[in-house]
C-alpha cells in the first residue's frame, strides 16, 4: 500500500517517499522506484538553507553600498549573505535592507547607549551636576568641574549645556 506520510527529510511524490535535497543543493529530479532523488549544488552566489525540494536556489542578498550597506558575513551555498551598515549608520529594519545615519545627542543630552549596526543612538538628558556642550553620537554627559577641589569657587553655575565657571576665592561677593 502506498505511503500517506514520509519520514523526516523525505517528501511524498507519486505515492512514493523521496529524499529531500540537503542544504546547499537543489532538486534536479525526483526519485523513482529505481533511482534516488537527484540533487545539484547551488551555483556561486546562490544558497538553500534547508532540506528542500526546490528546483532553484535563492540568490544571495546584495549589500548595496548606495544604501549604506556592507557585507558582514559572506554567504555560502547553505547561508545567505548578512548585510550590516557602514560605520556611523544603522539598519532601518531587522532585515537590514537599508541604513540611516546614527542620531547625535544634542547639547544638554548625553549618549546613554552608543548605536550599533542594528540600533540607533539612545540619548538621555543631562541631569543637574552634568552637562554636554556638543552634538555627538558618542559623548556621555560630563560632570561639572568641582571648583572646591581646585581651591576655587563657583563664579557661574553650570547648566545642562555648560560647565561651571570657577574663579579665585577673593572674587566671592
Amino acid at each position: 500500500e502506498p505511503p500517506t506520510a514520509c519520514r523526516e527529510k523525505q517528501y511524498l511524490i507519486n505515492s512514493q517517499c523521496c529524499s529531500l535535497c540537503q542544504p546547499g543543493q537543489k532538486l534536479v529530479s525526483d526519485c523513482t522506484e529505481f533511482t534516488e532523488t537527484e540533487c545539484l549544488p547551488c551555483g556561486e552566489s546562490e544558497f538553500l538553507d534547508t532540506w528542500n525540494r526546490e528546483t532553484h536556489c535563492h540568490q544571495h542578498k546584495y549589500c548595496d553600498p548606495n544604501l549604506g550597506l556592507r557585507v558582514q558575513q559572506k554567504g555560502t551555498s547553505e547561508t545567505d549573505t548578512i548585510c550590516t551598515c557602514e560605520e556611523g549608520w544603522h539598519c532601518t529594519s531587522e532585515a537590514c535592507e537599508s541604513c540611516v545615519l546614527h542620531r547625535s545627542c544634542s547639547p544638554g543630552f548625553g549618549v546613554k547607549q552608543i548605536a550599533t549596526g542594528v540600533s540607533d543612538t539612545i540619548c538621555e538628558p543631562c541631569p543637574v551636576g552634568f552637562f554636554s556642550n556638543v552634538s555627538s553620537a558618542f559623548e556621555k554627559c560630563h560632570p561639572w568641574t568641582s571648583c572646591e577641589t581646585k581651591d576655587l569657587v563657583v563664579q557661574q553655575a553650570g547648566t545642562n549645556k555648560t560647565d561651571v565657571v570657577c574663579g579665585p576665592q577673593d572674587r566671592l561677593r
Partner: antibody
C-alpha cells in the same frame, strides 16, 4: 547645626512688593544653594527657584520669572526673595531650604526654614 | 518640565498598618552614568515645614526611622511605611531633582481611620 531662620509674617496690599529673608547658620553659606518653595493655603509645594550665594547665580521656575527676585548677602549669610506686583493669588507660605552644597550630589532639600506667611489683601 | 503624579491623594489607615504611596514621573529619573534616581520624599505636618525622609529614591535621611523605605526606578517609585505610628499621620510629597524646574507630586495625606 544647620539652621535656616526666616523673617516674620507679612500682610501686603495688592500691587505692592515684599522681601522675605532667610538667615543661614551652621554651614558654608556661600557654596550651598538656597532653594525657595511656596505653598498656597491647602495646596501642595511649588518650587520657585534657587540662588548660589557666592556667585549670585540663579535658577528660576519659568512661572515665577518677573515675580520673584533672589539676592544674597554673604557677609550676613542671608538670602532674600523679593516678590513684586503682589496679587491675592500670591498669598502663601514661602519656604527657603538648603540645596546642593557644592558636591553636586545633594540637590534634595535637607534643611528648611520655618516658613514665612505672606498674605495679600486689600 | 517633568510632571510628578502621586497616588492616592489620601489614605485612611490605623496605627500598625502598612501604607504604600506611589509616585510616577513623566520621564525617567534614572541617570545611566551614576545609576542614580533623582527622587526625594518629604513628610509635612500641619503648620510645619516639610522634612526630608528619603533621597536618591531609596536612601534614608539620617535620623529617619527604618519603618520608612523608598523603592522604584526610572519612572515609578514607592514610599512605604511598614508599621504606621501615631506621629506618621501627615502629608507626604515626592520631588524630582533631575533637571530644572524641580517639581513635587501633589501630596498624599495619611489620615487616621
Amino acid at each position: 547645626q544647620v539652621q535656616l531662620v526666616q523673617s516674620g509674617a507679612e500682610v501686603k496690599k495688592p500691587g505692592s512688593s515684599v522681601k522675605v529673608s532667610c538667615k543661614a547658620t551652621g554651614y558654608t553659606f556661600s557654596t550651598s544653594w538656597i532653594e525657595w518653595i511656596r505653598q498656597a493655603p491647602g495646596q501642595g509645594l511649588e518650587w520657585i527657584g534657587s540662588i548660589l550665594p557666592g556667585s549670585g547665580s540663579t535658577n528660576y521656575n519659568e512661572k515665577f520669572k518677573g515675580k520673584a527676585t533672589f539676592t544674597a548677602d554673604t557677609s550676613t549669610s542671608t538670602a532674600y526673595m523679593e516678590l513684586s506686583s503682589l496679587r491675592s493669588e500670591d498669598t502663601a507660605v514661602y519656604y527657603c531650604a538648603r540645596g546642593d552644597d557644592g558636591s553636586y550630589v545633594r540637590w534634595y532639600f535637607d534643611h528648611w526654614g520655618q516658613g514665612t506667611l505672606v498674605t495679600v489683601s486689600s | 518640565d517633568i510632571q510628578m503624579t502621586q497616588s492616592p491623594s489620601s489614605v485612611s489607615a490605623s496605627v500598625g498598618d502598612r501604607v504604600t504611596i506611589t509616585c510616577r514621573a513623566s520621564q525617567s529619573l534614572l541617570f545611566s552614568v551614576n545609576q542614580k534616581n533623582y527622587l526625594a520624599w518629604y513628610q509635612q505636618k500641619p503648620g510645619k515645614a516639610p522634612k526630608l525622609l528619603i533621597y536618591w529614591a531609596s536612601t534614608r535621611e539620617s535620623g529617619v526611622p527604618d519603618r520608612f523605605s523608598g523603592s522604584g526606578s526610572g519612572t515609578d517609585f514607592t514610599l512605604t511605611i511598614s508599621s504606621l505610628q501615631p506621629e506618621d499621620f501627615a502629608t507626604y510629597y515626592c520631588q524630582h531633582y533631575y533637571s530644572y524646574p524641580w517639581t513635587f507630586g501633589q501630596g498624599t495625606k495619611v489620615e487616621i481611620k
